[in-house]
């Protein structure tokens, strides 16, 4: 689609004579009639294919032709065409007399024809006017003409159509050969796709508008390069999103469980050696000359009863001194000078010769012990409490006093937290060594999955069309809300599409 | 590379009836939505009738009462059975199957199937 333009310059009738030589009375009061058709070898008469146009009477006899362009449009004069141009063209001027005011062909005479020019020849469209000047014997026409698209036509024949557009179907200007140029951050064959923030993550990250990025579901940051760990992991990171990977020294399912108690907490008191043993469990080696679970307590060199054979210690700033009962020798009064003569068993113990007399034995009742059954026994001197209990003689037997979470005589059993079933909504307790946890069925959450969380049908976009996503939270389904022109339970289907839709 | 073909197009008389189908071929379209729509000369495309990835139908005024879509997911096709056929049913009948892949939207469109109503 595109206009033929015809612009009359000068024309010279200095006799202001017809084109029988007979003259014009009073003058020649002149007036076009343009005719342009398809291209012919020899310009002959019959249809004007590509269209006709007349001008009012512009003047008498010899006159130059005003541009009237911006006033009423009428020099250059205008065909237009709604067809491809095909680079050729034939064209008719005739410059007619009007004796008066009525121009149409049958008010006049078939002799007020002044002059008729006919040329024919190729012509490519462009802003470029080209300038021509045809002479007969009595006049002289000097004119200019070119061809020029349509609005929102382009290309060498005006059979391109683009019409710039910056909506949900397109955003671009049209370049001189009709080729879209998308505006800036757009993208695409038909500059649909916005150019997202630069380094957006190609498959994390998008965006529905230039210079922005939005998240998938699973990651984060400014562009969407960050996964987002399991919700409440505690001392984990991810790789992928909703991992839980355990840093070093925590394990469980959200890397709460303290497997580094030693180096987290540094229990051990007084220069112990400490060694995990198992979550938030450990065991702390004394030096010498400190007990407790902790090592905390500091020990009497006498504590450990090195003196033997009812002898007594006494505390030394160098370590300890035995003074012996009589009978007894010795750094530990360890050595006898008794026999079984002497009765040296004590709390009831039998008295057993050795060596022809020259040494004895004692055989002590039970709760003593000592070489002459002088000691109490110490039940708890073996440890026998798990688990970090503490030990506590109670007479003649002995008990163990339990850290939290365990039971039984020797504090060999743990506490069962699951026996209660605190896990709501079908959740599976897991029993560990410092508490419990519950792992919880889809669509609840929580400590004990008491809390109902609903399971997020819009989370994968299904809906088209820039459609508003909700979840419906009794289903866990999603309605999409259609915006106006579009169907469908996702909005898939536009109602209509225009002509120009680039399809 | 997705490809939609139509068949089925051809000259009737008013009150006739014709039965347009469209092969999918390129993927798996039973868990995609598929359409018919048409274009008379000189108007815009307009929606005939949908079927939504989850079975709901979505039927053009014009159509209520008088066209009938179905898919047969085997076959990878979906039908347009149209009864009672009006000359304003003329027009070229386009089979569209609109795609969602990572959060971006596909639009594809058969080539046409001309159905022209005779008075």
């Known amino acids: 689609s595109g206009v033929f333009q015809l612009q009359l310059q000068e024309f010279i009738n200095e006799r202001g004579v017809l084109a029988s030589g007979r003259p014009c009375e009073p003058g020649c009061r002149t007036f076009f009639r343009v005719c342009l058709k398809h291209f012919q070898a020899v310009v002959s008469p019959g249809p004007c294919t590509f269209g006709t146009v007349s001008t009012p009477v512009l003047g008498t006899n010899s006159f130059a032709v005003r541009d009237d362009s911006s006033g009423g449009g009428r020099n250059p004069l205008q065909l237009p065409f709604n067809f491809t141009w095909p680079g050729t063209f034939s064209l008719i001027i005739e410059a007619w007399h009007a004796p008066g005011d009525d121009l149409r062909p049958e008010a006049l005479p078939p002799d007020a024809l002044i002059s008729k020019i006919a040329i024919q020849g190729s012509l490519a469209v462009g802003q470029n006017w080209l300038l021509d000047e045809q002479t007969s014997t009595l006049t002289r026409l000097r004119y200019s003409y070119r061809v020029i698209c349509s609005d929102n036509y382009y290309g060498d024949n005006c059979s391109r159509l683009c019409k710039k557009r910056n909506d949900h179907f397109g955003h671009y200007v049209c370049q001189p050969d009709g080729n879209l140029s998308c505006l800036p951050g757009w993208t695409g064959e038909y500059c649909q796709q916005p150019i997202c923030l630069s380094g957006c993550h190609e498959q994390n990250g998008y965006c529905s508008k230039p210079a922005e990025c939005l998240c998938r579901p699973g990651w984060q940051g400014r562009l969407c390069n960050e996964c987002i760990p399991h919700n409440g992991c505690r001392h984990g990171t991810c790789s992928t999103p909703w991992q839980c990977t355990c840093d070093e020294g925590w394990g469980g399912l959200f890397c709460d469980q303290d497997l580094n108690y030693c180096t987290h907490h540094s229990p051990c008191k007084n220069g112990a050696t400490c060694s995990n043993s198992g979550q938030r469990s450990y065991t702390c080696t004394c030096r010498p000359g400190y007990t407790g679970v902790d090592c905390e307590l500091e020990l009497s060199e006498c504590d450990s009863n090195p003196c033997r054979n009812g002898g007594s210690c006494k505390d030394q700033e160098d370590g300890y001194h035995c003074l012996c009962p009589p009978g007894y020798y010795g750094l530990h009064c360890e050595h006898s000078t008794l026999s079984c003569a002497d009765s040296p068993c004590f709390n009831g113990g039998s008295c057993r010769e050795r060596n022809q007399g020259a040494n004895y034995a004692c055989e002590c009742p039970p709760n003593f012990t000592g070489s002459n059954c002088e000691k109490k026994v110490d039940r708890c001197t073996s440890n026998p409490c798990a688990n970090g209990g503490q030990c506590l003689n109670r007479g003649p037997s002995r008990m163990c006093r339990c850290r939290p979470g365990f039971t039984g005589t020797y504090c060999e059993l743990h506490v069962s937290d699951c026996a209660r079933n605190p896990c709501a909504h079908g959740g599976t307790c897991h029993d560990l060594e410092n508490g419990l946890m519950c792992t919880c069925p889809a669509g609840f959450s929580g400590r004990r999955c008491e809390v109902r969380t609903s399971i997020d049908a819009c989370a994968s976009s299904p809906c088209f069309n820039r459609a508003t996503c909700y979840t419906d939270l009794s289903t866990d389904t999603f309605v999409c809300n259609c915006p106006y022109g579009f169907v469908g339970s996702r909005c898939e289907f536009p109602v209509g599409l225009p002509p120009s839709f680039p399809w | 590379e997705v490809q939609l073909v139509e068949s089925g197009g051809g000259l009737v008389q008013a009150g006739g009836s014709l039965r347009l189908s469209c092969a999918a071929s390129?993927?798996?379209?039973?868990?995609?939505?598929m359409g018919w729509y048409r274009q008379a000369p000189g108007k815009q495309r307009e929606l005939v009738v949908g079927?939504?990835?989850?079975?709901?139908?979505h039927y053009a005024d014009s159509a209520k009462g008088r066209f009938t879509i179905s898919r047969d997911d085997a076959k990878n096709t979906v039908y347009l059975q149209m009864n009672s056929l009006k000359t304003e049913d003329t027009a070229v009948y386009y089979c569209?199957?609109?795609?969602?892949?990572?959060?971006?939207?596909?639009?594809?469109w058969g080539q046409g199937t001309q159905v022209t109503v005779s008075s």
């Open positions: 569209y199957v609109p795609v969602k892949v990572a959060g971006l939207e596909y639009a594809y």
């Open positions: 390129g993927s798996t379209f039973s868990n995609y939505a």
């Open positions: 079927i939504s990835s989850d079975g709901s139908t």
